[in-house]
């Protein structure tokens, strides 16, 4: 057993049917040493007296907030969750395999740049009696400071039968430079309640690795004269970090037709500019990535040909 | 990225060149190795990510952008010097970075370049003859030493007496592959960064 | 912060019925358990019927049959249903709310609490 937060205590206990499970003696947080009784939420059923309570914790209805109470007058509350540890593997039933970019890849997290600022986000089905907590660090032997906010939910969607969830998180290192050459990674540790189950999560990465920049900006198209050529012309995304001369940008200039099934013309280009054969009803389409570090490409950014 | 690039103009800076190649060559040794080496730790998340040049030179430092010296956490251990050395500044009066960061530069290339022959070395004892390095990737290595023009000492090449133990030369070939790929890719923003200005 | 909201309480003949209603807003988190008390006047206040988080629902001796407590977790709202009123049921009905925000703690909240009289 382990204090998560104050009065908040998480019970790790082997899953498997006729398991023992793990004795829990809780402590009345008072100096009253005679009257104090226990109850268990918000039942008045009396489970025992005295200042400390002996309970045998084997399944989620031995979970709960347990209160000691003296002549009406509550003392103190200790809520106990449940960790589950199945054929030696910690329980992950809160949230969503998303098995991208691999299997068990519960949290997923981009960077728009190099700032030290990333978003990383999860899903779950899970509608109700959720909360989330997140911490992050540089390393995990002698961490740096990474600030994260509240996880909120982002985004609802309807997946066949089911809705899904999807909850998410910005964090920043504390002092980041972007030219840094990355060693130590970031760590990403979620802590995950629904109920009374806890599970936590975690996820580690170098920020060159989640790099995927913003669609290039003021994507344009000048006619050239007397031709079906056109110069398509765009801009860095605001947000990419700065100098362009030094975090440089290539791009991949796509001509595709109304329809999916037609051939799709490429160029790549590390100018912010190129010529491409416009055709009708065609659009054109423009994304970025890191000259020098694939990571992910951005998004298209695309106008119509016509 | 084995996709068609619209190539750059050829009267540009001449570092510039050179340090593509050998992004391009880094990058497709580490494929290699990443690739015959799948059954040892060799990826990005397996292994431990070290710094030969750590204390030795300080690149990341020297050839900072002047854009980034306003940024305090960049600034932890930066010595600035404006004096401009070194073919590839040449006819360039630029105050960015000097001598100190293109020395620096040649001082890590120079380290690589000692560690990779030392352990080619030893690869081309091992009967598996399982993975050597990429004699392409070592020429890049010494053509952008000599577009940098930079004289130094000669280290001499490491020798061993002892039997190489040919797992931990392959593991240590990852991390050293993994840590030069990332310095290219500083010397490239670096050259990149020169070239425009 | 979490708030409690409660309504559906009135005058209500005896042996009639009332649904009361408690809606959270806020960031309740998981909630651990919700309780309808409630106040006579110069009387304390008393449990009248509560739900854990595994389902459990318990009820005082002397609203057992008549009172059921229900949740409809996509309104974030708790509901008492009162059957079969007595006059004895007359008193102010409070909902309290206990859960755990990851981000807070644990906390605990009360709503303002709504008018039940039972009378001819």
């Known amino acids: 057993i382990w204090e998560l937060k104050k009065d908040v205590y998480v019970v790790e206990l082997d899953w498997y049917p006729d398991a023992p499970g793990e004795m829990v003696v809780l402590t009345c947080d008072t100096p009253e040493e005679d009257g104090i009784t226990w109850t268990l939420d918000q039942s008045s059923e009396v489970l025992g007296s005295g200042k400390t309570l002996t309970i045998q914790v084997k399944e989620f209805g031995d979970a709960g907030q347990y209160t000691c109470h003296k002549g009406g007058e509550v003392l103190s509350h200790s809520l106990l969750l449940l960790h589950k540890k199945e054929d030696g593997i910690w329980s992950t039933d809160i949230l969503k395999d998303q098995k991208e970019p691999k299997n068990k890849t519960f949290l997923r997290c981009e960077a728009k740049n190099y700032s030290g600022r990333f978003t990383c986000w999860w899903l779950t089905t899970i509608s109700t009696d959720l909360t989330f907590s997140v911490k992050s660090s540089r390393g995990s032997s002698d961490p740096q400071g990474v600030t994260c906010g509240a996880a909120t939910l982002s985004a609802e969607r309807v997946r066949g039968d089911n809705k899904e969830y999807e909850y998410s998180v910005e964090c920043q290192e504390d002092s980041a430079c972007p030219a840094a050459e990355e060693s130590l990674p970031i760590e990403v540790m979620v802590d995950a309640v629904h109920k009374l189950k806890y599970e936590n999560y975690t996820s580690s990465f170098f920020i060159r690795d989640i790099i995927k920049p913003d669609p290039p900006k003021n994507l344009q198209l000048k006619p050239l004269k007397n031709s079906r050529q056109v110069e398509v012309s765009w801009e860095y995304p605001d947000t990419w970090s700065t100098p362009h001369s030094y975090f440089s940008l290539t791009f991949c200039v796509q001509v595709q037709g109304k329809s999916k099934r037609e051939k799709k013309d490429r160029v790549f280009t590390d100018k912010t500019s190129a010529t491409v054969i416009c055709r009708k009803n065609a659009s054109i389409s423009v994304r970025a990535q890191d000259r020098y570090y694939s990571s992910s490409w951005s998004e298209w950014a695309s106008v119509p040909c016509s | 990225r084995n996709l068609p690039v619209a190539t750059p103009d050829p009267g540009m800076f001449p570092c510039l060149h050179h340090s593509q190649n050998l992004l391009r060559a880094v990058s497709n040794m580490l494929q290699k190795a990443r690739q015959t080496l799948e059954f040892y730790p060799c990826t990005s998340e397996e292994i431990d990510h070290e710094d030969i040049t750590k204390d030795k030179t300080s690149t990341v430092e020297a050839c900072l952008p002047l854009e980034l010296t306003k940024n305090e956490s960049c600034l932890n251990s930066r010595e600035t010097s404006f004096i401009t050395n070194g073919s590839c500044l040449a006819s360039r009066k630029t105050s960015f970075m000097m001598a100190l960061c293109l020395s620096s530069i040649y001082e890590d290339l120079k380290m690589y370049q000692v560690e990779f022959k030392t352990m080619n070395a030893k690869l081309l004892m091992d009967p598996k003859r399982q993975i050597f390095l990429d004699q392409n990737m070592l020429a890049v290595i010494d053509e952008l030493m000599q577009a940098l023009n930079f004289n130094s000492e000669t280290v001499p090449q490491k020798s061993s007496l002892e039997e190489p133990d040919f797992y931990k030369t392959k593991i240590k070939l990852c991390i050293l592959l993994h840590a030069f790929r990332i310095r290219a890719v500083t010397i490239d923003r670096v050259m990149s960064y020169l070239n425009a200005s | 912060e979490v708030q409690l909201v409660e309504s559906g309480g009135g005058l209500v003949q005896p042996g009639g019925s009332l649904r009361l209603s408690c809606k959270a807003s806020?960031?309740?988190?998981?909630?651990?358990?919700m309780g309808w008390y409630r106040q006579a006047p110069g009387k304390q206040r008393d449990l009248v019927a509560s739900a854990d988080s595994n389902g459990r629902t318990t009820f005082q001796d002397f609203v057992q049959g008549r009172f059921t407590i229900s949740r409809d977790s996509a309104k974030n709202t708790w509901y008492l249903q009162m059957n079969s009123l007595k006059p004895e049921d007359t008193a102010v009905y409070y909902c309290h709310l206990r859960g755990l925000q990851l981000t807070m703690g644990l906390y605990e909240s009360w709503g303002q609490g709504t008018q039940v009289t039972v009378s001819s």
């Open positions: 806020g960031s309740i988190g998981s909630v651990t358990s």
